[in-house]
Interface confidence: medium
């Protein structure tokens, strides 16, 4: 048989809220005192197995003994009852479990959700963590009906068991319970339809059009229970490789459809469509948005011409010159569509002209020497793009008017050029570009500005630390005006090797020093000052400075017949680079002067 | 390689009629003129009269004005020339050429790159 405690403690299941004062009492039965030979001044207690501190504890009567916690905060704690039976064997009179926490808050902010085809979802805040076992009871009625209640597991959410009703107002609220309190939350009164998140739309379609390369038409399948409701809808796109969306704005979807046209798009772009849908009065939740579909727009003529300009070869025996017209794909956002081939037309009077169709990007044409009207159009499938239109003039005119002021600089990692207009009214600019090099011809890039441009970066791909050589012209509707050009670097290095030097002359105290100038392929930047250190093997070093567009130096106060060790540096914006050493050897005496 | 094949020449009587061909080929870069140009011993070749491959214009030299036609088929790789009312001074080694010079000038031979081999065309009395 079980074993009669020998007393036991009051409560037996404590719960105390957390910061109040709390006291338990041990009531020892009296066989228990015959027995053991003690009162309730043997009592210790304990909180998980450590002694309670004397003056928490007080002797009610020669049965009874309690104890007393002020500001409990743990939230769980084992407190024990013992005896020191005989006055020195502690044993366990009882334990208990004192638990503490706080009572249920108000649950705030409820809020039911009916997601399409499921059951109804409420939501709440429910406020502080109570640290005890709390009951959330959502409950709901019609005014003259109950409905079953939903015993919440989360303590935050429910699903109600039964089926919506719509079109009828249902009253809903939350009960929270625990060991300390019981609490309810202000009710919410609401017809269910008006809580309805759709499922998304689906059977998303995109089509463009012939007629116009600006629109695309949408259509798609909704739901709304089965068409019990009427949705509005919410169209956002993107281009294909965009990140962000554009919305359609919201009152041009207000009415209930499964179509939509889509307007003031770019030509021949794709793109990516999502849509979702609410009750159209905005009651409810937006649907989660449909899977995305895509299209592209229809073609429509280039919008404008080709970048435009030409290279003239050595002339053929003064009678003809050959002529290489080059030209710049069109960007996607102006080809508007596959470009097929570009018309060429040169005419050299009103009654002398050539049609070439042309798939690639330059022609070559062999032309007199006089001047000649060169035009050009981009053709893709709907049709032409305006004509660029370059006169080449005859090679015995000389071109007038230059740019004025021309830089160039590096800044963002790009290589930018600037330059004031000439004074007569300028057509474009054409930059053209190459690396410099003694390796390497200079193959030249080339780009085209609009007359109102003065400043501009390259837009090739540079290299850092290669010198580019700059040039721009100015176009007039008469021909090309003067080029002028000028050499930058995207980013400067130190140069890849210092200057070779050498002796040109040698006298008993001094000594002319000379070199070449750094290919510049090895210059990695300009070269803006040299350094000659030269010394005696026992002697100090001594350095002298020089200006870049030396290549000589006279070297003075040099002692006669004594070896000498050189070596140049050459420096750039971004440092310098040693040559190698070179020693010489001053005689002892002068010419002509003997011992 | 660019290649000019003349055929057609012939003797014939004075006021008489003869038709030239020319056939082109290897061809990749488009030619704007096509020519016929003859020499006589002892003379400069000169030219007899050329058509614009693109818009088909004709040039004709004043000696052969009225007599001689230039022509080309449909698919641009022949030239024609159509010459009636032959006279004596027509006598001469005639030359198919080519030129791709964009000009007005189109019977000046500085301007043509590529010739055929000729075709020898006698008028008798």
């Known amino acids: 048989q079980l074993l009669e405690p020998c007393g036991y403690i009051y409560p037996e299941f404590p719960v105390v809220q957390r910061g109040s004062n709390f006291t338990a009492i041990c009531v020892l039965k009296e066989a228990c005192l015959q027995h053991y030979y003690v009162n309730a001044s043997y009592i210790v207690w304990k909180t998980n197995h450590a002694a309670v501190p004397r003056e928490q504890v007080t002797v009610i009567n020669r049965t009874t003994s309690s104890v007393t916690f002020t500001d409990v905060v743990l939230p769980s704690v084992q407190l024990t009852c013992n005896i020191l039976s005989f006055g020195q064997i502690e044993q366990n009179v009882y334990g208990v479990t004192m638990l503490s926490g706080f009572p249920p808050d108000k649950p705030t902010n409820l809020t039911c959700i009916v997601n399409e085809g499921k059951n109804m979802l409420c939501q709440w805040d429910p406020g502080r963590e109570t640290y005890l076992e709390t009951n959330y009871t959502l409950k709901s009625e019609w005014a003259t009906e109950k409905f079953p209640d939903c015993q919440s597991k989360h303590g935050t959410s429910c699903m109600v068991s039964y089926m919506p009703t719509y079109y009828v107002n249902i009253e809903v609220w939350v009960e929270a319970e625990n060991a300390l309190g019981k609490v309810s939350s202000e009710s919410i009164n609401f017809d269910p339809v008006d809580k309805v998140k759709p499922t998304p739309p689906y059977n998303l379609s995109v089509t463009n059009s012939e007629e116009l390369s600006s629109i695309l038409k949408l259509s798609w399948v909704s739901s709304g229970l089965g068409g019990l409701l009427d949705l509005k809808s919410d169209i956002q796109y993107r281009t294909k490789d965009a990140s962000t969306w554009i919305q359609v704005p919201l009152e041009d979807t207000m009415s209930p459809r499964t179509s939509f046209t889509v307007q003031d798009l770019k030509p021949f772009t794709e793109y990516v469509f999502r849509i979702r849908s609410i009750k159209d009065s905005g009651k409810g939740y937006w649907s989660d948005w449909s899977e995305e579909a895509s299209g592209t727009t229809y073609e429509d003529r280039p919008s404008r011409p080709p970048s435009f300009w030409y290279k003239t070869n050595p002339s053929h025996g003064q009678e003809y010159r050959s002529v290489r017209l080059i030209w710049k794909a069109l960007p996607l956002s102006e080809a508007n569509g596959k470009i097929l081939d570009y018309e060429v037309i040169l005419t050299q009077s009103k009654s002398v002209s050539q049609t070439y169709t042309v798939t690639g990007t330059e022609l070559t044409v062999n032309l007199t020497n006089d001047r000649y009207v060169a035009s050009l159009a981009a053709r893709n499938k709907v049709g032409k793009s305006a004509a660029a239109v370059l006169t080449i003039p005859s090679p015995h005119v000389t071109a007038a008017y230059s740019v004025v002021n021309l830089k160039a600089f590096p800044k963002d990692n790009l290589l930018w050029v600037e330059w004031t207009p000439p004074p007569k009214p300028v057509s474009k600019y054409i930059l053209e570009w190459c690396v410099l090099s003694e390796n390497a011809p200079c193959v030249e890039d080339w780009q085209q500005e609009d007359a109102t441009v003065n400043r501009t970066h390259l837009r090739g791909r540079l290299l850092e630390s290669k010198c580019y050589q700059i040039t721009v012209t100015p176009v007039f509707a008469t021909g090309p005006g003067g080029s002028e050009s000028l050499k930058a670097y995207l980013k400067q290095a130190a140069p890849a090797r210092g200057p070779t030097v050498r002796t040109k002359k040698v006298g008993k105290n001094e000594a002319v020093l000379a070199w070449d100038q750094i290919p510049v392929d090895d210059q990695n930047g300009f070269i803006r000052n040299y350094s000659i250190s030269y010394r005696t093997s026992v002697g100090k070093e001594m350095v002298v400075h020089v200006d870049s567009s030396h290549t000589e130096y006279t070297l003075s106060s040099l002692s006669s017949d004594t070896l000498y060790m050189v070596r140049m540096a050459a420096y750039t914006d971004e440092g310098g680079k040693d040559g190698p050493e070179f020693t010489f050897t001053t005689p002892k005496f002068a010419q002509g002067e003997i011992e | 390689q660019v290649q000019l094949q003349e055929s057609g020449g012939g003797s014939v009587q004075a006021g008489g009629s003869l038709r030239l061909s020319c056939v082109i080929s290897?061809?990749?870069?488009?030619?704007?003129?096509m020519g016929w140009f003859r020499q006589v011993v002892g003379k400069e070749r000169e030219g007899v009269a050329a058509?614009?491959?693109?818009?088909?214009?004709?040039v004709y030299a004043d000696s052969v004005k009225g007599r001689f036609t230039i022509s080309q088929d449909s698919s641009k790789d022949t030239v024609y020339l159509e010459m009636n009312g032959l006279k004596l001074e027509d006598t001469g080694m005639y030359y198919c050429?080519?030129?791709?010079?964009?000009?007005?000038?189109?019977?000046?031979?500085?301007?043509?790159?590529?010739w055929g081999q000729g075709t020898q065309v006698t008028v008798s009395s």
């Open positions: 050429a080519a030129s791709t010079v964009i000009t007005s000038e189109s019977i000046n031979r500085n301007l043509y790159q590529y």
């Open positions: 290897g061809f990749t870069y488009r030619q704007t003129f």
């Open positions: 058509i614009s491959t693109g818009g088909g214009s004709m």
